[in-house]
Amino acid sequence: TLNSVLNSNAIKNLPPPLGGAAGHPGSAVSAAPGILYPGGNKYQTIDNYQPYPCAEDEECGTDEYCASPTRGGDAGVQICLACRKRRKRCMRHAMCCPGNYCKNGICVSSDQNHFRGEIEETITESFGNDHSTLDGYSRRTTLSSKMYHTKGQEGSVCLRSSDCASGLCCARHFWSKICKPVLKEGQVCTKHRRKGSHGLEIFQRCYCGEGLSCRIQKDHHQASNSSRLHTCQRH
């Protein structure tokens, strides 16, 4: 099974009153009893930092990217890894720490004016001259968000779902990511049997809309595991 259970230490830190600060974001003090996480190990030590399984960069922290921990490793086993600092090797922008971007395989500083031109060039080459999609590459930049007023419409390049307008999500399309419609009731969805497997899809579907979940279609229960059809169904 994909679910592994953390050991049963109780939460020791009670939250503060409404609106109060609650410790340092990112600090992991202790874990809840019996919380389920994807992955193959039963985590015995909760005081130590445990890597977070992921399928794409947006699932990770702001200073992380999602990749296999070993070079040429199994694409299905990906975790959030620390971002690469300036002058380190990279393959894409998300690998570089904030304030940097990936140029010719090296993380370089994203000097605003210089960087903006680089990115416009990249997008124009790949997707035509649609400047409303610039925001798709802003995760690892120092560009001001004031430059972008509208959320991406269907087909716009994006990096994460919050780049897209309401009712859309950011999903892979060939080797880029674009805003696609969130799935409606009855639409076919993708249920991943192992976390990270949708890292292999080149036409990724959105998730099911609010109040829906991706489940096996009733009349497909008898089908073999590999051919089961999943659709978005009411909870």
């Epitope: 009670l14 990112g26 996480y37 445990q50 620390a82």
Partner: nanobody
Framework: EVQLVESGGGSVQAGGSLRLSCTAS????????VAWFRQAPGKEREFVAA????????HYANSVEGRFTISRDNAKNTAFMQMSSLKPEDTAVYYC??????????????????????WGQGTQVTVSS
């Protein structure tokens, strides 16, 4: 400053369902994880479920897996928790909380209460047998 307001609590018979809502105001919370914690009388506050900033990732406590479903609608700045097949042991005050996307995320991040900067006042859920 983010303010969180829970609604949807109430009394229900065992086996019944409730849907909790958590509405945020003050700033968009699409770069926050949203979670539900609960506290029964005389017990510690415990993690129930969380949904990450990326929308696609949800986490549940063993005790509610398969019965509760967490979701969110960023356009409405609202998170939801559909609770079904409720049991008397689900009786508690349910709190909604928001945690900022951290620099580094670990498996413990979502269930650790000290990571959550903003909390609602809670909504009572009572399940009678």
């Amino acid at each position: 400053e983010v303010q969180l307001v829970e609604s949807g609590g109430g009394s229900v018979q065992a086996g019944g369902s409730l849907r909790l809502s958590c509405t945020a105001s003050g700033r968009p919370f699409d770069n926050y994880a949203v979670a539900w914690f609960r506290q029964a009388p005389g017990k510690e506050r415990e993690f129930v479920a969380a949904i990450s900033w990326s929308l696609s990732r949800t986490h549940y406590a063993n005790s509610v897996e398969g019965r509760f479903t967490i979701s969110r609608d960023n356009a409405k700045n609202t998170a939801f928790m559909q609770m079904s097949s409720l049991k008397p042991e689900d009786t508690a005050v349910y709190y909604c909380a928001a945690a900022p996307r951290p620099k580094r995320v670990s498996v413990q991040y979502f269930s650790t209460s000290s990571n959550y900067d903003y909390w609602g006042q809670g909504t009572q859920v009572t399940v009678s047998s």
